[in-house]
């Protein structure tokens, strides 16, 4: 997956730090105070859909095959720049019953982006 | 994840059968002759306006939080209806060296859809 460098507008990973204080979650998330979540942005022209070596690749390639042929209903289905590889992270937080939970939360950090 | 039933236009899973003959792959894929790949389609309104947040990852929830507030750069970042749970499937096919390979291919079948 590409890292966004400002030079390309093709689907890429953009660095982004989430501050839990900024979104009002700091009184129930004990740790960390924030984290590098990152996000995906950029264009997904038809020729690169499903070619990023992403976790969606076989399915994306198949659907893209139909899409490129103008096959209904895929002709109008837009390929999207989305996370294709995410990483877990450990968090300490209060749950709904005010109990303290330490848990590895899946899919917190975007590692790679690709076209769906 | 929702199943598309024709009544809602919210992000949902649509049944779709892929015929390998249709896409010209039948000369190198020995078995199966096709499979239910399915795909995702539908709108991704702000999380709270959606009918279900149950398949949203933590990352999606956080980014959507910023997006709802019109926070740059997320205000113009579109949330996409994409696979959130995929299933593998076994395939028998010829590799580049014309060897017959039997392999469980990851992420072939879309099981659930959600908003990125």
């Amino acid at each position: 997956g590409l890292e966004c460098d400002g030079k390309v507008n093709i689907c890429c990973k953009k660095q982004f730090f989430v501050s839990f204080k900024d979104i009002g979650w700091n009184d129930w998330i004990i740790a960390p105070s924030g984290y590098h979540a990152n996000y995906c942005e950029g264009e997904c022209p038809s020729h690169i859909a499903g070619t990023s070596g992403s976790s969606l690749s076989f399915h994306s390639t198949v659907i893209n095959h139909y899409r490129m042929r103008g096959h209904s209903p895929f002709a109008n289905l837009k390929s999207c720049c989305v996370p294709t590889k995410l990483r877990p992270m450990s968090m300490l937080y209060y749950d709904d019953g005010q109990n303290i939970i330490k848990k590895d939360i899946q899919n917190m950090i975007v590692e790679e982006c690709g076209c769906s | 994840g929702l199943e598309c039933d024709g009544k809602v236009n919210i992000c949902c899973k649509k049944q779709f059968f892929v015929s390998f003959k249709d896409i010209g792959w039948n000369d190198w894929i020995i078995a199966p002759s096709g499979y239910h790949a399915n795909y995702c389609e539908g709108e991704c309104p702000s999380h709270i306006a959606g009918t279900s947040g149950s398949s949203l990852s933590f990352h999606s929830t956080v980014i959507n939080h910023y997006r709802m507030r019109g926070h740059s750069p997320f205000a113009n970042l579109k949330s996409c209806c994409v696979p959130t749970k995929l299933r593998p499937m076994s395939m028998l096919y010829y590799d580049d060296g014309q060897n017959i390979i039997k392999k469980d291919i990851q992420n072939m079948i879309v099981e659930e859809c959600g908003c990125s």
């Epitope: - | 279900s52 149950s54 507030r69």
Partner: antibody, heavy 123, light 107 residues
Framework: QVQLVQSGAEVKKPGASVKVSCKAS????????IHWVRQVPGQGLEWMGV????????NYAQKLQGRVTMTTDTSTSTAYMELRSLRSDDTAVYYC????????????????WGQGTLVTVSS | EIVLTQSPATLSVSPGERATLSCRAS??????LAWYQQKPGQAPRLLIY???DRATGIPARFSGSGSGTEFTLTISSLQSEDFAVYYC?????????FGGGTKVEIK
């Protein structure tokens, strides 16, 4: 400690409007959603809708769509629920409750409730 | 919308006995279900969340079980202060929906 304090009882005529307030304290207001739930005397609980205190985004129960408006004032940590075109069957105790909505953490239960506001609709 | 059906509507139990309340969902809500206790003139109080987790300060005699579509709230040995109405709510989907309630009364 967390508190949701609601405005006092109201008596309204059919066709009028009512605006109930819910003042939050003891937590970061914008970190939670505010849900509104009503209860006709002697009956069960009915979900009316929700507002994100962070963004102001709303989701209303279908049967109340067009008659209900939920708003927040983050400067005073107060949520409001306005119900218009009141009918006699709107006579109920109206509750606000806070919740998070983060499926990935299994969060979504209403953990704190206001004391309730009785709205009586009578000619 | 997801319909929650509670049974029985009324449960007559003697103090010290066990009470078993049921909540059935019209479709799977995973473990996104909570139980509330409500006494006359009071707001509901959270007892169980995540189908089986007890909220802070709730006595151990209250327990929840189930996932998907079938859920149970058990009060192992009823105390006088437990006679009340109990509601389940699902928070898997919008709209949020409540069960019709079970009234636990003294036999």
């Amino acid at each position: 400690q967390v508190q949701l304090v609601q405005s006092g009882a109201e008596v309204k005529k059919p066709g009028a409007s009512v605006k109930v307030s819910c003042k939050a304290s003891g937590y970061t207001f914008t970190g939670y959603h505010i849900h509104w739930v009503r209860q006709v005397p002697g009956q069960g609980l009915e979900w009316m809708g929700v507002i994100s205190a962070y963004s102001g985004d709303t989701n209303y129960a279908q049967k109340l769509q067009g008659r209900v408006t939920m708003t927040t004032d983050t400067s005073t940590s107060t949520a409001y629920m306005e119900l218009r075109s009141l009918r006699s069957d709107d006579t109920a105790v109206y509750y606000c409750a806070r919740a998070r909505d983060i499926a990935a953490l299994g969060l979504g239960a209403f953990d704190y409730w206001g004391q309730g506001t009785l709205v009586t609709v009578s000619s | 919308e997801i319909v929650l059906t509670q049974s029985p509507a009324t449960l007559s139990v003697s103090p010290g006995e066990r009470a078993t309340l049921s909540c059935r969902a019209s479709q799977s809500v995973s473990s996104n279900l909570a139980w509330y206790q409500q006494k006359p003139g009071q707001a509901p109080r959270l007892l169980i969340y995540g189908a089986s987790d007890r909220a802070t300060g709730i006595p151990a005699r209250f327990s929840g079980s189930g996932s998907g579509t079938e859920f149970t709230l058990t009060i192992s040995s009823l105390q006088s202060e437990d006679f009340a109405v109990y509601y389940c709510i699902q928070y898997s989907n919008y709209p949020r929906t409540f069960g019709g309630g079970t009234k636990v009364e003294i036999k």
